[in-house]
Structures are given as C-alpha cells and as structure tokens.
Interface confidence: low
C-alpha cells in the first residue's frame, strides 16, 4: 500500500524521499517517475539525478531540497487533477537489485473557494531526515542500465511479484529514507 499525500489544484505538491550518502558528495543516482516503480529504472521519468547533478527534468518537476545531502524529495508546481496518481522514487543503490523503491500516492483535490495552504504532513516528525554520513571511502556507483523505453504493461506482473512487502513498515519506521553504505 502506498503512502498518500494530498495537495490542492493550483498549489505545489511535495513527495518526500531521502537517502543518506555513504560519504559527503558520494551521490547515488535517483529517478522519479509517474506510475508505480517497475522492475528496473522508472517509468515515465519526470526527473533524474546522477552522481553529480540533476541531469534530467521536465516542466514543473524539481528538487527543492539539498539533493547533495540526500534530500531527493519531489516538488510538483501548480498541480492539476491530472497529476493525481502513483509516483515512484527509485534510489539506485550500487549492486544489482539493491535499488530502493518507494511508491507514493498523490491525491489532488479541487481548489476550495477560499484558497488554503497545501495539506501536508509534519514531515519533520513523520520522516526524520537521517542525513548523518558513514565512514566509507569513495564508492563507484553501480546502477542498473538505463531503460527509458521500458514497457510498464509488459512487466507489471513481474513488478508486482518483486514489490517489497516491507515497504509499508519501512515507510512507517523511517519515512522514504534509507542509508547508503
């Protein structure tokens, strides 16, 4: 089951996702996609980072936090009802099949007559940012190959089989936050 986040039409939506770099500046590629996390990569990629920088993004999707410290939370500007749905945050940890996958459900509500602030959780309390670094030396990033044209229909069955049953517990315990290294 996905963790649900809400925003109103015309406002910005925030989808939290964090990891802890193994060492300062030792970044791990991350992709954000529209739709549940497939087996590899992200489907319908809206934003991607590499070991150095944000290397791909689309209109209205950006990282507001300090991604160099592992805050890869996605902000979607000026949302519409069409932005509702599942989003995948995939942290491409070195090692095959070691990727961390977080499915987050975004629910967009029609704007109220009287505009109100975006309903968000208290993420500081619910999702403590575990951004302490660990004492490993530089580590080469070993990600899966880029699969931009992956067919979600073809692999949906396998994706369901591989979906991590512990996701809900992990999100409950630490938010979409993982440690690398």
């Amino acid at each position: 089951s996905e963790v649900e986040y809400r925003a109103e039409v015309g406002q910005n939506a925030y989808l939290p996702c964090f990891y802890t770099p193994a060492a300062p500046g030792n970044l791990v590629p991350v992709c954000w996609g529209k739709g549940a996390c497939p087996v590899f990569e992200c489907g319908n990629v809206v934003l991607r980072t590499d070991e150095r920088d944000v290397n791909y993004w689309t209109s209205r999707y950006w990282l507001n936090g300090d991604f160099r410290k592992g805050d890869v939370s996605l902000t979607i500007e000026n949302v519409t009802l069409a932005d509702s749905g599942i989003y995948c945050c995939r942290i491409q940890i070195p090692g095959i099949m070691n990727d961390e996958k977080f499915n987050l459900k975004l629910v967009i509500k029609p704007a109220k007559v009287t505009p109100a602030p975006t309903r968000q959780r208290d993420f500081t309390a619910a999702f403590p940012r575990m951004l302490t670094t660990r004492g490993h030396g530089p580590a080469e990033t070993q990600t899966l190959g880029s699969l931009p044209d992956i067919n979600l229909t073809q692999i949906s069955t396998l994706a369901n089989e591989l979906r991590d049953s512990r996701l809900a517990n992990d999100l409950r315990d630490s938010g979409a936050t993982i440690r690398i290294g």
Epitope: P29, D50, E51, I96, M97, N98, A139, E140, G145, S165
Partner: antibody, heavy 117, light 113 residues
C-alpha cells in the same frame, strides 16, 4: 575482515534434500547482496540463486521450483534449501556477497554437494 | 538475460608470452550516466573461490599484478596477461553486472605450452 563460511554439503541420493548454510560477518550480511554459485566438475561457474538485503530473490532456470534461497538476518546466515536433487546438481557450492558500496565480491571457500545413488 | 560469450575456450601460452582472452556480451553493458562498463574478470583456480582481477572493464583490483589488464567497451572486452607466469594457470571468466542475473562467460582455460 569479511568472512563467509559454508556448511551443509555432503552426499545425497537423487530426489533427496540438503540445506546449505553460509555464515557471514555482520556488516556484509546486513547490507549485502548474497548469492550462491556452483561449479560442477569440469564445468564453469553458474549463478544458482541470489537474494538482496530486502529479500528479493533470483534463481537460475535449472533450479527454479527445487531450490529456495533465504536469509536469517538475526543469525547473519544465508541458506539454500535444495530439494529434488539430481545428479547434475553435483558441484562445489560457493556463497558470495557483494556490498552495496563495493564492486568486489567476497567468496566462501565452498562446500561439496554430491548427488549419487 | 545478457549472454556472455568467451573465446577461446582454452589456450596454451609459453611462459613469458602474452595471453589474450575475449569476451562478448549480447547487449551493451556500458551505462552512459557514469561512463562505466559493468564488466569484471575473475580468475578461478581448482579448490579456490574466484578472485576478482578487473572491474569496470579496465580497473585492476588492489593487489593484482600489473601484467593483468582489461580493455574494451560496450559489448567487446579483452583480458590480457602480458607475460604469463606459472601461477597464472587457471580458468578466467568475464561477468557482467549491468543487469540481473549477473551472467558469466563460459570460461577460458589458460595453460602453459
């Protein structure tokens, strides 16, 4: 120092079962992508099965439905339950681990499995 | 799965001579995001676990003699032993770690002529 120690190998009749164990040092086990390889006499290395730190498993076609990989995080131990064994499963079985932040693999010394009547 | 094909299956080389092993993958193992080839070379001796020699196709593992070198990119790779020593007699494997399962080549047995 990283250590992987396999056990549980031996002689078994066709159709029988064995359970291999691999005891690993804590850090590599809790974070590691763990695999079983095997090398049959005169043959190359073959990936038998793998499991990542979150429990996602992978099997070679030749063992699907017969072998089950699992891990006990509380004991830092990797297992390979081998059922319906066949003569062609005879091999030295190696436990190997890959840490997420490293490329190199760590290997155990291997345990012999012989399937013969 | 990515298929890995090694050639030759075996070769015999005189001591001090060059040994060359080829490895071909059925699809590219190069990831352009980080300009890395996800290919390693292992040495396997009887009764011993495999030993990593080369990773990222051309990076020598710590402690591996510099007579071992790796080259190539995309789908075609080569392991070269520049001056064969008696202790180099073994079976050598290439392995891709671009996608799961991490598939191995069939191995190349290196002997002394």
């Amino acid at each position: 120092e990283v250590q992987l120690v396999e056990s549980g190998g031996g002689l078994v009749q066709p159709g029988g079962s064995l359970r291999l164990s691999c005891a690993a040092s804590g850090s590599i086990f809790s974070n590691g992508y763990m695999t079983w390889y095997r090398q049959a006499p005169g043959k190359g290395l073959e990936l038998v099965s793998s499991i990542n730190s979150r429990g996602v498993t992978n099997y070679a076609d030749s063992v699907k439905g017969r072998f089950t990989i699992s891990r006990d995080n509380s004991k830092n131990t990797l297992y390979l339950q081998m059922n319906s064994l066949r003569a062609e499963d005879t091999a030295v079985y190696y436990c190997a681990a890959l840490l997420p932040h490293e490329i190199r693999k760590y290997w155990g010394q291997g345990t012999q499995v012989t399937v013969s009547s | 799965d990515i298929q890995m094909t090694q050639s030759p299956d075996s070769l015999a080389v005189s001591l001090g001579e060059r040994a060359t092993i080829n490895c071909k993958s059925s699809q590219s193992v190069f990831y352009n995001s980080n300009n890395k080839n996800y290919l390693g070379w292992y040495q396997k001796k009887p009764g011993q676990p495999p030993k990593l020699l080369i990773f990222w196709a051309s990076t020598r593992e710590s402690g591996v003699p510099d007579r071992f070198s790796g080259s190539g990119s995309g789908t075609d790779f080569t392991l070269t032993i520049s001056s064969l020593q008696a202790e180099d007699v073994a079976v050598y494997y290439c392995q891709q770690y671009y996608s799961t399962p991490r598939t191995l080549g069939g191995g190349t047995k290196v002997d002394i002529k």
